[in-house]
């Protein structure tokens, strides 16, 4: 999916009120410094197209991000500010229900989540910069 | 400290495929950033071609996007470049890297293929 | 597409002596640049990252500076080892990062 069409705006409303509280909570107990940050993202597009492979990919060691509140609202976010994409979800759809049901918080899981924050820290960073 | 080595043909015939593999020691490519490769053809600059996340996402440049393929092997700690439809202009040292997604950290030290029949 | 353009081309001096090297970006890239140094039949090595920071194991000597279309490398005082091909690369314009055609530090 091409999140060039989407309305950035709406989207850092949307995380600053709930996802960023969602991942926070998510991450509580555990300090910013525990995880180094290995991915980044150069302009809003590419934030958006990292942030949702990050979120809705599993990956072999955490493999439940999906199932998560925090990627139930990134994806409704991003359904409803990005034309179209709602449509080209069908093969994540099916990953969410494929993700484990247990709610066990790896470290491997906190690791990906951190780089997440991340993720949506540079895309807020990148639309002040645009403003 | 994390170290790359790139192998495949020296010699490739126009209009074949070109495949590369980069094997990755001192980090597991599973575990974080990502993994890019980059071309320099002889006397000239920098190209970048593409790179791979650990989580799996994919991103390559638009100019040369129709004919490369970006994989991976976790279980060898190596990933690999398919270049298709070769010319003399794809003749280049090729250079795997280690990537953030914006800029590159570490590389491998680069090999020599030459698109020739 | 972004086009870097380095100057100059050929830069030719003395150890000991200060280098300042020029890239300048086709549009505004903001601080998303880096600067790589290369060697003879060596890869390129990350010198500088974001416009300003230095990588890991990069010596004081190595600075950059700049933000939206004009930057510059500066060698505060060029040892033996710093004679090679340096090269700008922005990071502002995904899909499409862009690297400058270099500029070679010679010994004069």
């Known amino acids: 999916y091409d999140f060039t069409n989407c309305d950035f705006q709406k989207i850092e409303a949307d995380y600053l009120r709930t996802i960023s509280k969602d991942l926070i909570t998510y991450m509580s107990g555990t300090k910013s410094t525990d995880f180094n940050n290995t991915v980044s993202c150069s302009n809003r597009p590419h934030c958006l197209t990292e942030i949702q492979s990050l979120t809705f990919n599993p990956t072999p060691r955490c493999a439940s991000l999906a199932k998560e509140m925090f990627a139930r609202k990134t994806k409704a976010t991003l359904a409803l500010w990005c034309p179209g994409y709602s449509e080209t979800q069908i093969n994540a759809t099916q990953a969410m229900k494929k993700a484990r049901k247990s709610k066990v918080t790896t470290n491997k899981c906190l690791e990906q989540v951190s780089q997440l924050l991340g993720l949506w820290r540079r895309f807020i960073r990148t639309l002040l910069k645009k403003q | 400290q994390v170290q790359l080595q790139e192998s495949g043909p020296g010699l490739v015939k126009p209009s074949e495929t070109l495949s590369l593999t980069c094997a990755v020691s001192?980090?597991?490519?599973?575990?974080?950033?990502?993994w890019s490769w980059i071309r320099q053809p002889p006397g000239k600059g920098l190209e970048w071609i593409g790179y791979f996340s650990y989580y799996g996402s994919t991103s390559y440049n638009p100019s040369l996007k129709s004919r490369v393929t970006i994989s991976r092997d976790t279980s060898k700690n190596q990933f690999s470049l398919k270049l298709s439809s070769v010319t003399a202009a794809d003749t280049a040292v090729y250079y795997c890297a280690r990537t953030n997604l914006l800029y590159f950290d570490s590389w491998g030290q680069g090999t020599l293929v030459t698109v020739s029949s | 597409e972004i086009v870097m353009t380095q100057s100059p081309a050929t830069l030719s001096l003395s150890p000991g002596e200060r280098a300042t090297l020029s890239c300048r970006a086709s549009q505004s890239v903001s601080s998303n640049l880096a600067w790589y140094q290369q060697k003879p039949g060596q890869a390129p090595r990350l010198l500088i990252y974001?416009?300003?920071s230095r990588a890991t194991g990069i010596p004081a000597r190595f600075s950059g500076s700049g933000s939206g279309t004009d930057f510059t490398l500066t060698i505060s005082s060029l040892e033996p080892e710093d004679f090679a091909v340096y090269y700008c690369?922005?990071?502002?314009?995904?899909?499409?990062?862009?690297f400058g055609q270099g500029t070679k530090v010679e010994i004069k």
């Open positions: 001192g980090y597991s490519i599973s575990s974080g950033y990502g």
């Open positions: 690369q922005q990071y502002s314009n995904w899909p499409q990062y862009s």
């Open positions: 974001d416009a300003s």
